[in-house]
Amino acid sequence: QEPSCTMPSTDVDWNTEFSATCLNFSGRGLSLPLNQSLRASNVLLLDLSGNGLRELPVTFFAHLQKLEVLNLLHNPLSRVDGALAARCDLDLRADCSCALESWHEVRRDNCSGQKPLLCWDTTSFQHNLSAFLEVSCAPGLAPATGSGHHHHHH
């Protein structure tokens, strides 16, 4: 069972230094700052699920050296930045979508001995990402169609 933590009750101030090992910003309608790093040097698990995020500003994650789990479920991601994908020890939780192709490719090319990457469908069922991309994102299919998996229920 994955660890969990409750979300901060106040509005998020990105200048705050967060000391916790777990941060829950799920379902807050957040927009991540483009040129500012999250200050959370202890965080192991960061939950950004259900925030309508399309982009993941690479600077935002730059100083999270201890991060192990990044929960991005229920966000309509258009792409995953290569620098983030290249963090081989980062466990990314995301919805099945063709936007994860870059993540898969970077991991395949840069990370050896990895367990199979997974993605989640709208019923919270796990899929092998490689198999999903092969079936749903083959050349000729519209990008990010993902066989309906890009529709998210919060």
């Epitope: 994955e2 660890p3 933590c5 090992t21 829950n24 040097s41 789990v69 466990d91």
Partner: antibody, heavy 125, light 107 residues
Framework: QVTLKESGPGTVQPSQTLSLTCSFS??????????VSWIRQSSGKGLEWLAH???????RYNPSLKSRLTISKDTSSNQVFLRITSVDTADTATYYC?????????????????WGAGTTVTVSS | DVVMTQTPKSMSMSVGERVTLNCKAS??????VSWYQQKPEQSPKLLIY???NRYTGVPDRFTGSGSATDFTLTISSMQAEDLADYHC?????????FGAGTKLELK
């Protein structure tokens, strides 16, 4: 098999510096997510966390003792060290080192899965 | 610092009885709580992590539950080898902190 073993001087005089060594085997402290903490226990008392060192040499200290503590590691020889300066009788305790593992099949947890047997330190003149 | 308060300080139980140990955090720590068993003259051993995950090799009579501020370790049917001190600890925030322990004795 993962093992940790603490060693220390046994007795140290007040105001002196206490140096402790944790020798471990069965894992590498260069593995991402891995870390080792020092924790102590005074006679009949609870556990007190002192310091932690990460695989990337980042360190964390208990603020109540921070000015007196230094944690370090030698990855190649599989050892972690703790120095406590200006000791007094309140530092008399059993000192443990313990491993914080990285669980690649459900990350984000923090716990100590393996502890050393402990080394007893008495501060006395 | 997060204060972890364990109750009771000690308890005497008979073999086969159900044992419930409590741990209360002074602030919300999510599920970042572990339970450790410490037998006399031994070092602590991990029983439960993440509030409810049983560590490898731990008998299934040990169960952890709770979240936020209230946590429980239950031994469904106490065995003689369970006589020990039990410590809860939180790892949600630094400094990491532990409770004072509960001593489980034989009635």
């Amino acid at each position: 098999q993962v093992t940790l073993k603490e060693s220390g001087p046994g007795t140290v005089q007040p105001s002196q510096t206490l140096s402790l060594t944790c020798s471990f085997s069965g894992f590498s402290l260069s593995t991402s997510g891995m870390g080792v903490s020092w924790i102590r226990q005074s006679s009949g008392k609870g556990l007190e966390w002192l310091a932690h060192i990460y695989w990337d040499d980042d360190k964390r200290y208990n603020p109540s003792l921070k000015s007196r503590l230094t944690i370090s590691k030698d990855t190649s020889s599989n050892q972690v060290f703790l120095r406590i300066t200006s000791v007094d009788t309140a530092d008399t305790a059993t000192y443990y080192c313990a491993r914080r593992p990285r669980d690649f099949y459900g990350g984000g947890h923090w716990y100590f899965d393996v502890w050393g047997a402990g080394t007893t330190v008495t501060v006395s003149s | 610092d997060v204060v972890m308060t364990q109750t009771p300080k000690s308890m005497s139980m008979s073999v086969g009885e159900r044992v419930t140990l409590n741990c209360k955090a002074s602030e919300n720590v999510g599920t970042y709580v572990s339970w450790y068993q410490q037998k006399p003259e031994q070092s602590p051993k991990l029983l439960i992590y993440g509030a409810s995950n049983r560590y490898t090799g731990v008998p299934d009579r040990f169960t952890g539950s709770g979240s936020a501020t209230d946590f429980t370790l239950t031994i469904s049917s106490m065995q003689a080898e369970d006589l020990a001190d039990y410590h809860c600890g939180q790892s949600y925030n630094f400094p990491l902190t532990f409770g004072a322990g509960t001593k489980l004795e034989l009635k």
